[in-house]
C-alpha cells in the first residue's frame, strides 16, 4: 500500500531512507531543460522476491530542445547536487541495504536527473532524520518516522527530534544516542501529519484530505 503522504517535515532537518521497501516508486524527474523521453517510464519501482529486490524500469532524460538524444550515464561530479531526501552527507555508512530482504538499495543516478529525488513510499517504510548543518539535535525519542496503516488509513509516526541553532551537526542513527524522554509527545493516532513548503507542521488537515485537497477558483 502506498503511503498517502510524505514523511513529516521537521524544521531544520532532513530525512533519508537507508533502504526502500518493495513497492516504492521513484519519479523519473529531469532537471530543467530536459524531459522524460517519449515512451519513457514515469517512475522506477522497487520490485522483487524474498531473496532479491531491484528497481524496475529505467529513467531517461532527453534535452527539451533536441528530440532524439537520450542518455543514461552517471553524471559528472559537478552534477551530483544534494538531493533533499536521499543523499544527505553523513560520515556514517548506511546499513548494508543488500542484507535487508524485500528492500532495494539507492538507485544509481541517471544523466540529467532532477537535483531532488522524489520517492513515494509504501506502508512499513522507515526514514531517519538528522539536523542540517549548523543545527544540533535534541532528542525526545527516536529520530525516525514509520509509515503505518491504521483503520484503513496510512499515517507517518512523528519523529521525536528538535533541531536547535547551535553550530554542531547531528548524524544518522548510530552516531549519537537518542535521549528517550517521558515528556516526549505521543505520536498521533488520528492521521498523518501534513507539511507545507515553509516547513511549518500542520496537524489539522486530515479532514481536508477526506473530502477534497484542492480548491479551485477563477479570476
Amino acid at each position: 500500500e502506498l503511503c498517502d503522504d510524505d514523511p513529516p517535515e521537521i524544521p531544520h532537518a532532513t530525512f533519508k531512507a537507508m533502504a526502500y521497501k518493495e513497492g516504492t516508486m521513484l519519479n523519473c524527474e529531469c532537471k530543467r531543460g530536459f524531459r522524460r523521453i517519449k515512451s519513457g517510464s514515469l517512475y522506477m519501482l522497487c520490485t522483487g522476491n524474498s531473496s532479491h529486490s531491484s528497481w524496475d524500469n529505467q529513467c531517461q532524460c532527453t534535452s527539451s530542445a533536441t528530440r532524439n538524444t537520450t542518455k543514461q550515464v552517471t553524471p559528472q561530479p559537478e552534477e551530483q547536487k544534494e538531493r533533499k531526501t536521499t543523499e544527505m552527507q553523513s560520515p556514517m555508512q548506511p546499513v548494508d541495504q543488500a542484507s535487508l530482504p524485500g528492500h532495494c538499495r539507492e538507485p544509481p543516478p541517471w544523466e540529467n536527473e532532477a537535483t531532488e529525488r522524489i520517492y513515494h513510499f509504501v506502508v512499513g517504510q522507515m526514514v531517519y532524520y538528522q539536523c542540517v548543518q549548523g543545527y544540533r539535535a535534541l532528542h525526545r525519542g527516536p529520530a525516525e518516522s514509520v509509515c503505518k496503516m491504521t483503520h484503513g488509513k496510512t499515517r507517518w509516526t512523528q519523529p521525536q527530534l528538535i533541531c536547535t541553532g547551535e553550530m554542531e551537526t547531528s548524524q544518522f542513527p548510530g552516531e549519537e544516542k537518542p535521549q528517550a524522554s517521558p515528556e516526549g509527545r505521543p505520536e498521533s493516532e488520528t492521521s498523518c501529519l501534513v507539511t507545507t513548503t515553509d516547513f511549518q507542521i500542520q496537524t489539522e488537515m486530515a479532514a481536508t484530505m477526506e473530502t477534497s485537497i484542492f480548491t479551485t477558483e477563477y479570476q
Epitope: 502506498l2 498517502d4 510524505d6 524531459r35 522524460r36 517519449k38 527539451s64 532532477a114 485537497i213
Partner: antibody, heavy 104, light 110 residues
Framework: PGGSLRLSCAAS????????MNWVRQAPGKGLEWVSY????????YYADSVKGRFTISRDNAKNSLYLQMNSLRAEDTAVYYC??????????WGQGTLVTVSS | QSALTQPASVSGSPGQSITISCTGT?????????VSWYQQHPGKAPKLMIY???NRPSGVSNRFSGSKSGNTASLTISGLQAEDEADYYC??????????FGTGTKVTVL
C-alpha cells in the same frame, strides 16, 4: 468567446512540490478529457492538442498552487475543470472542480 | 489522440460480478502498464479505483480489480452493490507523454 480566464487550484494536505499535477475537464453530460500536465518542478509541460497554443499551465510551489491560463476561449471549452495530482500512473486526488462557461 | 473505447453501459444485479472493458492501441493501453480506472458519481469529482493496471489505492474495496491483455484493459467489480452505481472511466498514459481517457461506462445495479 475569445476571452480569457485564469483558473487557480490551491492544494493542501500534502507536499505539493513533490507531485506532478494535471488539469482534466468534463463538458456537461460528457466524459473526462485530459487537458494539461506539469512536472513537480514546473520544468516539463504537456498539453492536449485541443488546447495547445491557447492554454498555459503553471505552478507556484511556494504557494502550493496550480494555475491554468485560458486564452482565446471557445464555446467547446465550456466544462467543469478539475486539478488532479498524479502518483504512479493514475490521478489519485482531484479537486472539487469549477465550472467554466463560455458564451456570448 | 482518440478516446479509449468503453461500452456505454453495463448492468448487473446485487452480488453479481461485472466487467468493463477499455480498448486502446499499442501507443497507449498496449504500450504501458499505466492504466487507471475512476469512479464518478453524479455531481462529484472522479475517484481513483485502480492505478497501474491492477493496483488498488488504500481505502478502495477489494471488490474492484483490474487487468490488461494486449490493447484492452478491464475493470471487474465483484459482489456488486447499490453504491457501485456510477460512471466509470479508464485512462492511459500515451507515447506522446500525454493521457487519454475512455468514453465512459454507466454501471447500473438492477
Amino acid at each position: 468567446p475569445g476571452g480569457s480566464l485564469r483558473l487557480s487550484c490551491a492544494a493542501s494536505g500534502f507536499t505539493f512540490s513533490s507531485y506532478e499535477m494535471n488539469w482534466v475537464r468534463q463538458a456537461p453530460g460528457k466524459g473526462l478529457e485530459w487537458v494539461s500536465y506539469i512536472s513537480s518542478s514546473g520544468s516539463t509541460i504537456y498539453y492536449a492538442d485541443s488546447v495547445k497554443g491557447r492554454f498555459t499551465i503553471s505552478r507556484d510551489n511556494a504557494k502550493n498552487s496550480l494555475y491554468l491560463q485560458m486564452n482565446s476561449l471557445r464555446a467547446e471549452d465550456t466544462a467543469v475543470y478539475y486539478c488532479a495530482r498524479r502518483r504512479g500512473g493514475g490521478f489519485d486526488y482531484w479537486g472539487q472542480g469549477t465550472l467554466v462557461t463560455v458564451s456570448s | 489522440q482518440s478516446a479509449l473505447t468503453q461500452p456505454a453501459s453495463v448492468s448487473g444485479s446485487p452480488g453479481q460480478s461485472i466487467t468493463i472493458s477499455c480498448t486502446g492501441t499499442s501507443s497507449d493501453v498496449g504500450g504501458y502498464n499505466y492504466v487507471s480506472w475512476y469512479q464518478q458519481h453524479p455531481g462529484k469529482a472522479p475517484k481513483l479505483m485502480i492505478y497501474d493496471v491492477s493496483n488498488r489505492p488504500s481505502g478502495v474495496s477489494n471488490r474492484f480489480s483490474g487487468s490488461k491483455s494486449g490493447n484492452t484493459a478491464s475493470l471487474t467489480i465483484s459482489g456488486l452493490q447499490a453504491e457501485d452505481e456510477a460512471d466509470y472511466y479508464c485512462s492511459s498514459y500515451t507515447s506522446s507523454s500525454t493521457y487519454v481517457f475512455g468514453t465512459g461506462t454507466k454501471v447500473t445495479v438492477l
